[in-house]
């Protein structure tokens, strides 16, 4: 997911509808004016705000990367929702990119969970039921795998 290209200092002057802040805050879909007197609406498809706020600028909409699909567009009150394409997933510890799901489990393991946009396939040992760490398995150890992928330890 990437931020919009427009740099903060290059943004055009807002021409949006204005209203007054309530106790110094503006509603979702707005930001506060430079003198704090008005609430200015965010620009649809360009920026947004999700909460009551005193932000001087609305938050820039994110754009889905290649390898992602847009589940819902950016509105003035909600950011774009992007999801990894089928066959890929995004881990919590590396959210910046979608990774390819493994095509199979190492020998001696069985698949208990499918590839989803949020997780790789899940493998467990046939006997013990211990989960596999999630690294891509070595070719010689796999039931079904793409060539050249490195081995991984089991937990």
């Amino acid at each position: 997911i990437t931020q919009q290209d427009l740099a903060p200092q290059q943004r055009a002057a807002p021409q949006q509808k204005r209203s007054s802040p309530s106790e110094g805050l503006c509603p979702p879909g707005h930001h506060i004016s430079e003198d704090g007197r008005d609430c200015i609406s965010c620009k649809y498809g360009q920026d947004y705000s999700t909460h009551w706020n005193d932000l001087l600028f609305c938050l820039r909409c994110t754009r889905c990367d290649s390898g992602e699909v847009e589940l819902s567009p950016c509105t003035t009150t909600r950011n774009t929702v992007c999801q990894c394409e089928e066959g890929t997933f995004r881990e919590e510890d590396s959210p910046e990119m979608c990774r390819k799901c493994r095509t199979g489990c190492p020998r001696g393991m069985v698949k208990v969970g499918d590839c989803t946009p949020w997780s790789d396939i899940e493998c467990v040992h046939k006997e013990s039921g211990t989960k596999h760490s999630g690294e891509v398995p070595a070719v010689e150890e796999t039931v079904t795998s793409s060539p050249g992928t490195p081995a991984s330890p089991c937990s």
Epitope: Q3, D54, L55, L56, L59
Partner: nanobody, 128 residues
């Protein structure tokens, strides 16, 4: 608690330039998201410019864009505001401020109107 001390104000003719400085102490300067605000006589506080702790995200009020430049020197614990092509309407007390509850989204800093730590201000007067 961070303390801020502005300097560099004074009287200048229209079209002239000034450089304001804000020295910070009592905190790790490189972790502070900061900004400049101003208050003209008989008027309310107005946002001028803001800069993220890294200096990567910079914002300006429409009224000063192209004339003012914000910068920081983390090694010197100092925030700057270079003001050029000054106009009579720029006359105000200029305040350096720290955003102690910064908003970050997608790694980008977004300034607020309600900065919470303030300096004592420095007066800038623009008159012929």
């Amino acid at each position: 608690e961070v303390q801020l001390l502005e300097s560099g104000g004074g009287e200048v003719q229209p079209g002239g330039s000034l450089r304001l400085s804000c020295a910070a102490s009592g905190s790790t300067f490189s972790s502070l998201d900061m900004g400049w605000f101003r208050q003209a006589p008989g008027k309310g506080r107005e946002f001028v410019s803001a800069i993220s702790r890294s200096g990567d995200n910079i914002y300006y009020a429409e009224s000063v864009k192209g004339r003012f430049t914000i910068s920081r020197d983390n090694a010197k614990n100092t925030l700057y505001l270079q003001m050029s092509s000054l106009r009579a309407e720029d006359t105000a007390v200029y305040y350096c401020a720290v955003d102690s509850q910064p908003t970050y989204s997608g790694g980008v800093y977004y300034p607020r109107y309600g900065y919470d730590v303030w300096g004592q201000g420095t007066l800038v007067t623009v008159k012929p």
